[in-house]
Interface confidence: low
């Protein structure tokens, strides 16, 4: 089927269109093209006879138009009028005519667009603000920018006027940026030049610079404000309600007890018609005054809080010092003090904390110190300590336990057996005890004021027969030549014996080796390898005797220097090269190669087959011990000779 | 007839810097704006941003924004993007096209493309 | 940022089929633009504002849609047109693409 396909569909004024023909059928006469959706000689633009190859104007031509021979049309130099349809009427050789209607639309090329406003000055949290995109196009979209970023989400901006106005209601401070608009069409699209708002605030209450109040006789009185405004506000101080002048600063040389008093700066903008005031209150003093220390925190907890001294009064223009425990302070990250050393704080209190704290304020002739301050810092319980240690107690003996948990204030302390409350004390005796008061014991600790609470729990057994002892360690794995290991005979037994063996045999004579705690604890120092053997202890008291299970000691070592073998260093060509590396160490190490500085493989045993000489160099076995953090290296030279100059023997 | 040619791949190590460039031929650099458009392997095409070469004027994408910098020489009717602070996820093939200042920002010439590596 | 969703994200047909692409944009924009792109190569600009075919781009192809959705239609698949296709929207910063839609032989 005839068909018009319009290249582009959209086209923009002063361009070109191409009225593409397609399926346009065989043996023509000619064609002819029509503007609108109908054939109508009065609307002809343009008609061509394929015979002569002669194209004819009609009434509808404009110069603009081109006809091809494959009846496609080119319209040049685009007017809007242009928009619409097109007819494309075919006359075939049989005089059995065919049509078919295609279309395009025009847009403009947009113009750069420019922003009006309908107020240039807009006061803070009084005003609206409508900006609006011009010119107004037809068939246009319209877009905002604030900050070359797309409008925020917010119920003080209103789009209107088919976006092309843009409001802010209630304007504030913070709308002051720089605005575009943006308009678009199928064809083009142009943003304009940036429209700067200008909004009128102000004055904020203004702040009077600096902040200290207290100032000593003789010094220079110099008081500067400053107000948020826009315009900049205009200033004015006041001494005691009484009109000094109009400046932003002001000030006052040499002045005197009778300086002291209220001083009022009051701000004003000329635009808005606000003003704004604000009152310090200034005292002079003939002499300083005694300082003293003011805290923010009287009872700080431990570990949470921080807290700040303050050395009273602020007086302009002196030195503070300080002391902790009667020295200078010491040097610590916890401590900071302010620019001006007035004020000392200590970050995370530790229960180390305490003090005394003195300031000082330095005068001519000597320095003032405060009275001592005392910080009562909160802390614990830590974990409470249950004393004596033994675990193990005979019948018909007493006993008498005692808790201790380091707290400020004191821990309040509660017994538990088996989980039932006895008694709110610090220590629990039971007199006469028997099998039957075995069981868990527990302490616990309560700080009232921290909130804070703390457990031990100890398990007593109480019996006539030894239980079977069992060794601790506080080192599973211990490195040769650097650690030492020290095992622990567990339980710890009331008026009992400790012994101990080492692969079946009691203790060697050693500098290394030493008994401590009752012999419950044995020490080996600087383990070696030898030291891998088996351990036991013993208990025993007059009743009975037991032995603990072994324990083995993995003493990690090495690498040692590694071994290459076999032996050999020269080689026939031809022959497979394979050569093994093997080092003493614990755990076992990882093996690598290199020949002549190149890596190889990571394998402990290295394999060339049928070697030259090109394989002569240095070949390198390099361990290392991941556990022990230690490395080894060996280097063997390899010589391959050609066949038949070989030094010695080859199999 | 337009041309873009970009410069060669880069290789950089994360934290680095690197700068493309793009030459245009064919047509008057100042009379369009340079965008950037990037494509992480296997996965979809991102924008960047662009720059207006008659005055420098850019446009960055909020993701981009602090790191990306646009900069243009026009004797020599060169662009440049600068991405500093790469991540291993800046690795890229990164296009430069040619969008008419007027136009709706569609882009029918692009750039060759260049390959920017970030690995450690 | 305006989401560009591209359905389906892969999709196999036949030599002479019709296909439809579809592109849902997360908030409503005013064009849409379409583009092709085969392997190792850059994306080449198929339809442009909506409904707009690039120069030398085949008849087959067609664009149609407005306000959050828009798609890209070939009316008879040739052989030449197995490839990956993106939408992209131009209304609002950041410029954003689709996904995409993986187009391969069934």
């Known amino acids: 089927k005839l068909t018009i396909e319009s290249t582009p569909f959209n086209v923009a004024e002063g361009k070109e269109v191409l009225l593409l023909v397609h399926n346009l059928p065989q043996h023509l006469f000619g064609y002819s093209w029509y503007k609108g959706e109908r054939v109508d000689g009065n609307r002809q633009i343009i008609g061509y006879v394929i015979g002569t190859q002669q194209a004819t104007p009609g009434p509808a031509y404009s110069g603009r138009e081109i006809i091809y021979p494959n009846a496609s049309l080119l319209i040049q130099n685009i007017i809007q009028n242009d928009t619409g349809f097109y007819t494309l009427h075919v006359i075939k050789s049989d005089l059995v005519n065919e049509e078919a209607t295609g279309q395009f639309r025009v847009y403009p090329e947009l113009p750069k667009p420019s922003i009006s406003s309908n107020n240039s000055k807009p006061v803070e949290d009084k005003d609206a603000v409508a900006f609006t995109c011009e010119p107004e196009t037809q068939d246009a979209t319209y877009l905002w920018w604030v900050n070359n970023q797309s409008l925020p989400v917010s119920p003080r901006l209103q789009l209107s006027n088919g976006n092309r106005t843009l409001t802010l209601f209630n304007v504030t401070r913070n709308d002051t940026a720089s605005y575009k608009c943006e308009t678009q069409n199928p064809v083009s699209a142009r943003r304009s030049d940036s429209v700067i708002l200008n909004v009128l605030y102000g004055p904020d209450a203004p702040t009077i610079s600096p902040l200290n109040t207290s100032y000593r006789s003789g010094e220079n009185l110099n008081l500067s404000c400053h107000a948020a405004s826009n315009p900049p506000a205009q200033y004015s101080w006041f001494v005691n309600g009484t009109f000094q002048q109009s400046t932003q600063e002001l000030f006052i040389p040499n002045i005197t007890v009778n300086n002291s008093g209220s001083y009022t700066c009051q701000a004003h903008n000329s635009d808005t018609g606000l003003n704004r005031t604000t009152v310090t209150t200034i005292t002079v003093y003939a002499e300083p005054p005694k300082p003293f220390i003011t805290s923010n925190n009287s009872n700080p907890v431990e570990d949470e809080d921080a807290v700040a001294l303050t050395c009273e009064p602020e007086i302009q223009n002196t030195t503070y010092l300080w002391w902790v425990n009667n020295q200078s302070l010491p040097v610590s990250p916890r401590l900071q003090l302010s620019n001006d050393n007035r004020t000392l704080t200590l970050l995370s209190v530790t229960r180390n904390d305490v003090g005394p704290y003195e300031c000082g304020i330095q005068n001519k002739l000597s320095v003032d110190h405060s009275d001592p301050v005392i910080l009562n810092v909160l802390y614990g319980p830590d974990d409470p300590t249950i004393s004596p240690s033994y675990t193990y107690y005979r019948p018909g003996v007493n006993l008498s336990l005692s808790c201790h948990a380091a707290s400020n204030p004191p821990a309040q302390y509660s017994w538990l057996i088996d989980g039932n409350i006895q008694q709110h004390t610090q220590e629990l005796f039971i007199s006469n005890i028997t099998e039957k008061n075995s069981g868990l014991y527990t302490c616990q600790a309560n700080n009232s004021a921290s909130g804070h609470s703390r457990t031990t729990v100890k398990t007593i057994t109480v019996s006539a027969e030894l239980p079977k002892p069992s060794i601790s360690s506080n080192n599973s794995k211990p490195v040769e030549d650097k650690d030492a290991v020290a095992f622990t005979c567990e339980p710890e037994a009331q008026n009992t014996t400790y012994l101990w063996w080492v692969n079946g045999q009691s203790l060697p004579v050693s500098p290394r080796l030493q008994l401590s705690n009752g012999n419950r604890t044995l020490t080996l120092f600087n383990v070696t390898r030898n030291d891998a053997r088996a351990y036991v202890c013993g208990i025993q008291n007059s009743v009975s005797a037991n032995r603990s299970d072994p324990v083995t000691l993995d003493v990690l070592y090495g690498p040692d220097t590694p071994i290459i073998s076999p032996p050999d260093s020269s080689y026939l060509s031809g022959a497979n090269l394979n050569l093994s590396c093997h080092s003493a160490s614990n755990p076992s190490p990882q093996y690598s190669w290199r020949i002549n500085g190149i890596p190889q493989q990571h394998t402990q045993v290295l394999f060339i087959a049928k070697i030259t000489p090109n394989n002569n160099g240095t070949y390198a076995c390099f361990v290392s011990n991941l556990a022990t953090g230690r490395n080894n290296s060996i280097v063997k030279s390899i010589t391959v000779s050609a066949s038949g100059t070989s030094p010695g023997l080859s199999a | 007839q337009v041309q873009l040619v970009q410069s060669g791949a880069e290789v950089k190590k994360p934290g680095a810097s690197v700068k493309v460039s793009c030459k245009a031929s064919?047509?008057?650099?100042?009379?369009?704006?340079m965008h950037w458009v990037r494509q992480a392997p296997g996965q979809g095409l991102e924008w960047m941003g662009w720059?207006?070469?008659?005055?420098?004027?850019?446009e960055y994408a909020p993701k981009f924004q602090g790191r990306v910098t646009m900069t243009r020489d026009t004797s020599i009717s060169t662009a440049y993007m600068e991405l500093s602070r790469l991540r291993s996820d800046d690795t890229a093939v990164y296009y430069c096209n040619e969008g008419t200042p007027t136009g709706p920002y569609y882009f029918d010439y692009w750039g060759q493309g260049t390959l920017v590596t970030v690995s450690s | 940022d305006i989401q560009m969703t591209q359905s389906p994200s892969s999709l196999s047909a036949s030599v002479g089929d019709r296909v439809t692409i579809t592109c849902r944009a997360s908030?409503?924009?005013?064009?849409m633009h379409w583009y092709q792109q085969k392997p190792g190569k850059a994306p080449k600009l198929l339809i442009y504002?909506?409904?707009n075919l690039a120069s030398g781009v085949p008849s087959r192809f067609s664009g149609s849609g407005s306000g959050t959705d828009f798609t890209l239609t070939i009316s008879s698949l040739q052989p030449e047109d197995f490839a990956t296709y993106y939408c992209q929207q131009r209304s609002s910063y950041p410029l954003t693409f689709g996904g995409g839609t993986k187009l391969e032989i069934k």
């Open positions: 504002s909506t409904s």
């Open positions: 908030s409503s924009v005013s064009y």
């Open positions: 720059i207006d070469p008659e005055n420098g004027d850019t």
């Open positions: 064919g047509f008057n650099i100042k009379d369009s704006y």
